[in-house]
């Protein structure tokens, strides 16, 4: 097979014919050294998935349910290109499965038992698989056959295409359960009509259904959405209140050696030449001999799926939970309202050891999951492999953009017993230099810089945000002669000062000696000119407070702070000489786990928090000899957020704006994936 050939998998005679036409037309418009199409015919989409996994084909377009099959072992395929619908300016690659109710009803998602339900059709995504998958563990046992369990859960339903003889309750609201538009309650509009007419109490449809059926806002305001956290929201807020986000139609390829760049090059060229309204001879999004051949007829074009986005992230936690429940039919033994152990995400093996000790001391109420970077941990929390971790504000922003929520804040200044209920203002992000140097904020160009990590608040977002507004470009590695900013590209000058050791050089975790607050300060002590840290860093590592060899003889007076007005001040004066106020670190979790995480952590800190005085013979949650493992070592307590329970409210408008501006310079693959 030529290196630049993409072997497209076709699943019918008609698809194979269109594929050959696709191949021939692409040959006529692409250079001979460009990508080419070859066609492979298989009997089904599942056969195509297997063929791609076995390297007998390279690509196929799949619906969401099949993307799930493609991702499962041993296939291990991943999404590489998404079809989009709507306009190029506002491309839609996903739809949202929602539960719609009338505003004047008074039940929540966890009170659906005994209500009347309206569905688009048996086995359909938004109308059946997702809602029933998510409700699966609440269905009465035995849960097989599924239709019988659903019939016994709701007091009456309309499920078009169901067997009305075997399961009459499923057709109670639409006698016969007709499987076409002859049934007035069939499909999306029909299921909504079933709710509108008062036949049902809830309709399982997609987010656009309400807008397509009710042009008038006043009419739409008579309806609400049920959210998974047992609240309700207006129908406009479907992005924050849905059962699952469902990808429409996606090209998949192998995770390793999958030719994703070549596939994108091919499809990008294809849409330029043969996309909507581009060519009379061949149309990519048209199927004269059938419907939706190779690609959906309704598609308007393609978007490249960000490389960080694997199938789990693409399909989303809710969708995977729903489909897995339906397919595997397994439910936890504990009732769903009981908090299972919380899986903490630990960064590399240093945090893992502390987490393991916590796990032992918590009698297994805490379990541990590891990842090599903060972004990998956030991704694990998103997809359910982990539940929670404590994050610097810069990562609270990324986690928030990825759908996670802040749960508790680390407090550093408030003494107990008021600590748990106090909202602190934050800490100061500062620039530290040696007293012996002549550096100021205005002459940093060409100097050696030390950062906690890329994407962190005091070490990156605040200083680089200020720098960006001064230099108007993102080439920070050219501004400083060299530095250590863990998480930078390995060949960047901002990895040059890092200490490693070797395979971990410049990695954003504790295996890199210059990582974090203490690491950035060590970098200044040993190699750098300026360190961007929190205001407490110098006092915490001088005067013998840090017993490590590099720190034990350091004196506080040998360091000073840079002020934005060009002056310098003592490290004792951060209130009058700082770059900005930074939001405290905070614990984040998925929405569905937030209450459990909060309850458990408040309980854990009562046992292992700052009230424990002797950490040499007791486990201490907020202690790790200046290494800030799992939590900052100067944490006094974890505090309730009260109404600051979204990332925007928690971080504050000013900080969110600053980080949003810095997104022009973003090197965060996860952020790119989460905003796709």
């Amino acid at each position: 097979v030529p290196e630049k050939s993409v072997r497209w998998c076709a699943v019918s005679e008609h698809e194979a014919t269109k594929c050959q036409s696709f191949r021939d037309h692409m040959k006529s418009v692409l250079p001979s050294n460009g990508p080419s199409v070859a066609c492979v015919k298989k009997a089904s989409h599942l056969d195509c998935i297997r063929a791609i996994a076995a390297n007998e084909a390279d690509a196929v377009t799949l619906d969401a349910g099949l993307v799930y099959d493609a991702y499962l072992a041993p296939n291990n395929l991943k999404p590489v290109v998404a079809e989009f619908y709507g306009s190029k300016e506002d491309p839609q690659t996903f739809y949202y499965a929602v539960a719609v109710v009338k505003k004047d009803s008074d039940f929540q998602m966890n009170q659906l038992r005994g209500r009347k339900s309206c569905h688009t059709g048996l086995g359909r995504s938004a109308g059946w698989n997702i809602p029933i998958g998510l409700l699966y563990c609440d269905l009465p046992e035995p849960r097989k056959p599924l239709e019988k369990a659903v019939a016994n859960f709701f007091s009456g339903s309309c499920v078009p295409c169901a067997d009305g003889t075997d399961f009459p309750q499923l057709c109670q609201l639409c006698p016969g359960c007709g499987c076409s538009t002859l049934n007035q309650y069939f499909s999306y509009s029909g299921a909504f009509k079933c709710l509108k007419d008062g036949a049902g109490d809830v309709a399982f449809v997609k987010h656009s259904t309400i807008f397509e059926n009710l042009a008038n806002k006043a009419d739409r305001d008579q309806y609400e959405l049920l959210c998974l956290d047992n609240t309700r929201k207006s129908v406009d807020e479907y992005k924050d209140c849905h059962l699952a986000r469902v990808p429409s139609h996606t090209v998949v390829a192998r995770s390793v050696g999958g030719k994703e760049d070549l596939i994108w090059e091919l499809l990008n060229q294809a849409q330029e030449h043969f996309g909507k309204d581009k060519s009379k001879e061949f149309q990519l999004f048209s199927s004269p001999h059938g419907k939706d051949l190779l690609f959906k007829d309704s598609a308007h074009g393609f978007l490249k799926v960000p490389p960080r986005m694997d199938a789990k992230m693409y399909l989303g936690y809710e969708y995977i939970t729903a489909i897995r429940n339906l397919r595997e039919g397994t439910c936890p033994e504990a009732p769903t309202d009981e908090c299972k152990p919380v899986k903490w995400c630990a960064l590399s093996h240093h945090e893992r050891l502390k987490c393991d000790e916590w796990s032992v001391n918590s009698a297994g109420k805490i379990e541990c999951e590891s990842a090599e970077t903060t972004e990998d941990c956030i991704a694990k929390i998103m997809n359910g492999e982990a539940d929670a971790m404590s994050l610097d504000g810069g990562f609270v922003y990324i986690a928030g953009m990825c759908g996670l929520v802040p749960v508790l804040a680390e407090n550093y200044n408030t003494p107990n017993p008021n600590c748990e209920n106090t909202a602190e203002e934050g800490y100061f992000a500062v620039a530290v230099v040696k007293s012996s140097s002549d550096l100021t904020w205005d002459n940093l160009k060409g100097k050696k810089s030390c950062h906690t990590a890329v994407g962190r608040t005091a070490g990156w977002n605040i200083p680089m945000g200020l720098l960006y507004s001064k230099i108007n470009h993102c080439r920070f590695d050219e501004f400083f002669s060299e530095g250590c900013a863990p998480g930078s590209e390995k060949n960047s000058s901002l990895c040059k000062l890092c200490m490693g050791p070797s395979p971990n050089l410049c990695e954003p975790n504790n295996k890199e000696g210059y990582y974090g607050y203490t690491g950035a300060f060590r970098c200044l002590v040993e190699k750098g000119d300026v360190a961007f840290v929190k205001h407490q860093t110098v006092p915490q590592n001088t005067g013998g407070k840090n017993p490590d060899a590099w720190a034990k003889n350091l004196k506080e007076e040998d360091y000073e702070l840079l002020c934005l007005d060009g002056s310098r001040k003592s490290v004792q004066e951060p209130a009058n000489c700082h770059l900005a106020r930074a939001p405290n670190h905070a614990v984040v979790a998925r929405k569905d786990k937030a209450d459990c995480v909060q309850t458990l952590l408040l309980d854990q800190q009562r046992m292992f928090g700052s009230s424990v005085t002797d950490c040499s013979s007791n486990f201490c949650l907020f202690e790790s000899k200046t290494k800030d493992l799992l939590f900052r070592d100067d944490t006094v307590c974890l505090a309730k957020l009260h109404d600051r329970n979204t990332y925007e409210k928690y971080l504050g408008e000013e900080y969110v704006k600053a980080v949003t501006n810095l997104r022009k310079c973003s090197t965060s693959p996860l952020l790119e994936a989460c905003t796709f």
């Epitope: 050891l353 000790e357 032992v360 001391n361 009698a363 486990f619 790790s624 000899k625 290494k627 493992l629």
Partner: nanobody
Framework: QVQLVESGGGLVQAGGSLRLSCVAS????????MAWYRQAPGQQRELVAG???????HYADSVKGRFTISRDNAKNTLYLQMNSLEPEDTAVYYC???????????WGQGTQVTVSS
């Protein structure tokens, strides 16, 4: 700082038992938490069982009901009683006292446990 030396490993048939010991060079009475870890070839080191100063224990799901951790502060020794051994339990077993700084990669020689089917 206390040094730890593991012993008691060996080759055993599936279904058999072994008792691992870990002797400390100093007092373990004030050590908050002690634990056994294991590492199979090509795998990450994983927590098997842990015990607090007060005697509370915690086990990995894969060994619950088969392994028992205990400590004898008078003998400065940590034990791991392993029953109903399975081939998947084959690994080098290490003990740790967590009193070392978490970020110091100090591990003893460990003791090899091989379970044949």
């Amino acid at each position: 700082q206390v040094q730890l030396v593991e012993s008691g490993g060996g080759l055993v048939q599936a279904g058999g038992s072994l008792r691992l010991s870990c002797v400390a060079s100093g007092s373990i009475a004030s050590i908050a938490t002690m634990a056994w870890y294991r590492q199979a070839p090509g795998q990450q080191r994983e927590l098997v069982a842990g015990i607090t100063r007060g005697g509370s224990t915690h086990y990995a799901d894969s060994v619950k009901g088969r392994f028992t951790i205990s400590r004898d502060n008078a003998k400065n020794t940590l034990y791991l009683q392993m029953n109903s051994l399975e081939p998947e339990d084959t690994a080098v077993y290490y003990c740790t006292d967590y009193s070392r700084r978490y970020y110091e990669d100090y591990w003893g020689q460990g003791t090899q446990v091989t379970v044949s089917s």
